[in-house]
């Protein structure tokens, strides 16, 4: 028999907590409370520890950091004597992906918890439509992602597997293209990137609309729509209309959702419809001219999703002008 | 180096009071817990009370109750224990040890050599 | 309070050998365990700590395992020199020993 008060104490098991780099985390760890508190957090990597905090007579003790947690950890000091010993992480590298023990003693009791640090990135990723030369390409491409992803294409909905994959970045994060060679095609396709430690998806769909053959001084109506299936209401998405022509990309109109503002770089270009439910993002483009015929590409983006819908807009000398020839 | 000094063996009349002494060296004194811990002659070991010398705060073992008062002398480096109203159960050796906590370890890992203390009239 | 149970007394061993001293926790002590030598005549000495984590300067011939309630202290390659009395000792509250295992060499 001791002299003390009786306190239940849970054990806790090794957490796995999994943070963003560049963000701030919180490595969790409780403790009975008790007076004469110790701290002291650890980080083990195959052949070393190294002190990352440590907290006694009191205070915090950082003789002994390890420099490589200067100014990035510190611990809730007016909640120690309540029994956390949790550990606030700012700033996350991937370096910093491990294991990391705190070792706490008061008067009464000694105790470890262990918590296993993972780090992931996962920069929204784009679906890019290129041409080069008489070639299409579908490019999937994420500047920053870790670990790997799981890249997957589907062509009409059915799994495909040849694809060019590109990648940079030998330890992480990693900077991933993956080429789709779609020329001749009027396939629908969709490409999805699994970051699976973060539990996060991105895909990208890309239709191509039948052609539509105008007159000039006509006008035509591109059509765009966002799918229900992709974007939960309260989603924050963009929508942008662009010209492509001989490979370079000339953006015709932009909206935001965030701030329901739109931007025309084009005078002929219109919504064709008020953008009062959001999900119709449909175009006109007025007064068609010869050099119109070409390439038009909507392009809805949000975090997990980017629609790409392609049209091809043919323009035919009218009557009037043919004759006048 | 790091040591800790008892003083030597003592031999006492029952019912006398009994100061011994534990001089630490070769390292900061007041970031190290001193723990006294009894061991008797069929070898079993048990913790009688331990000081924390930076506040000066004791945690005691229930079954030592009333039998040991510690103190520190923080100047000196010297942890002493005061056993009172001795009887013939108290003869055996007892032994301060360092319990570390600065480096994680929360063990001893430095032990005094012992009093040996016999009480007899 | 938590009582440490040592149950072999006295095991006996050849030079070269293996063994292995058991302990037992009446409850769940994580991994707060420390194992202890005390030579014939001689202070105890820290040989284990946090159940596995051997201290300075000792031989890897020693290896301390497990958690919770059961703790196995190893000697591989059993020496003379290793001729003692050897303690578990739980900090997961307070402090309390076992009651010591004696290693006699045949």
């Known amino acids: 028999i001791f002299l003390s008060a009786f306190f239940t104490y849970v054990p806790m098991n090794e957490q796995i907590i999994i943070g963003r780099l560049g963000e701030d985390i919180i490595l969790p760890s409780s403790f009975e409370r008790g007076s004469e508190v110790v701290i002291h957090w650890k980080y083990q990597d195959s052949y070393n520890s190294y002190n990352v905090h440590s907290y006694y007579k009191g205070s915090g003790r950082l003789e002994s950091q390890d420099t490589r947690y200067a100014n990035r950890t510190s611990l809730f000091y007016n909640e120690i004597q309540n029994g956390n010993a949790s550990l606030f992480f700012r700033r996350l590298s991937l370096l910093d992906e491990g294991i990391y023990t705190c070792y706490v003693g008061t008067a009464i009791q000694a105790i470890t918890n262990k918590v296993v640090l993972k780090v992931g990135v996962f920069l929204t990723p784009m679906m890019k439509y290129e041409k080069r030369n008489t070639n299409s390409f579908l490019i999937c491409n994420v500047l920053s992602v870790y670990p790997r992803p799981i890249i997957t294409w589907k062509m009409d909905n059915t799994p495909i597997s040849e694809n060019n994959m590109q990648e940079t970045g030998s330890l992480g994060p990693f900077s991933i293209n993956s080429t789709l060679n779609i020329t001749g095609s009027n396939s629908s396709y969709e490409c999805t990137i699994e970051n699976s430690l973060l539990k996060q998806t991105w895909t990208g769909r890309w239709t191509m609309k039948d052609g539509l053959h105008k007159m000039q001084s006509e006008h035509v109506s591109l059509s765009c729509e966002l799918v229900n299936d992709y974007f939960s209401p309260n989603q924050d998405f963009k929508v942008t209309w662009s010209r492509m022509e001989s490979g370079i990309s000339s953006i015709l109109a932009y909206y935001l959702s965030s701030s329901q503002n739109t931007t025309f770089y084009e005078s002929r270009f219109s919504w064709n419809k008020e953008l009062k439910n959001q999900s119709d993002f449909s175009m006109n483009l007025t007064d068609l001219s010869l050099s119109d015929s070409g390439e038009y590409l909507c392009n809805i983006s949000s975090d997990e999703y980017t629609l790409l819908t392609i049209h091809t807009v043919h323009v035919e000398p009218s009557q009037e002008t043919a004759s006048d020839n | 180096e790091i040591q800790l000094q008892q003083t030597g063996p003592e031999l006492v009349k029952p019912g006398a009071s009994l100061r011994i002494s534990c001089k630490a060296s070769?390292?900061?004194?007041?970031?190290?817990?001193i723990v006294w811990v009894k061991q008797n002659q069929g070898k079993n070991l048990d913790w009688i009370e331990k000081?924390?010398?930076?506040?000066?705060?004791?945690t005691y073992n229930l079954r030592f109750e009333d039998k040991a008062t510690l103190t520190v002398n923080k100047s000196s480096t010297t942890a002493y224990m005061q056993l009172n109203s001795l009887t013939s159960e108290d003869s055996a050796v007892y032994y301060c040890?360092?319990?570390?906590?600065?480096?994680?370890?929360?063990?001893?890992?430095?032990w005094g050599q012992g009093t040996s203390i016999t009480v007899s009239s | 309070d938590i009582v440490m149970t040592q149950s072999h007394k006295v095991m006996s061993t050849s030079v070269g050998d293996r063994v292995s001293i058991i302990c037992k926790a009446s409850q769940d002590v994580g991994t707060a365990v420390a194992w202890y030598q005390q030579k014939p005549g001689q202070s105890p000495k820290l040989l284990i700590y946090w159940a596995s984590t051997r201290h300075t300067g000792v031989p890897d011939r020693f290896t301390g395992s497990g958690s919770g309630t059961d703790f196995i202290l190893t000697i591989t390659n059993v020496q003379s020199e290793n001729l003692a009395n050897y303690f578990c000792?739980?900090?997961?509250?307070?402090?309390?020993f076992g009651g010591g295992t004696k290693l006699e060499i045949k």
């Open positions: 000081i924390n010398p930076y506040y000066g705060t004791t």
């Open positions: 040890a360092r319990w570390d906590y600065v480096s994680t370890l929360f063990a001893m890992d430095y």
């Open positions: 000792q739980q900090y997961k509250r307070y402090y309390t």
């Open positions: 070769g390292y900061s004194f007041t970031d190290y817990i």
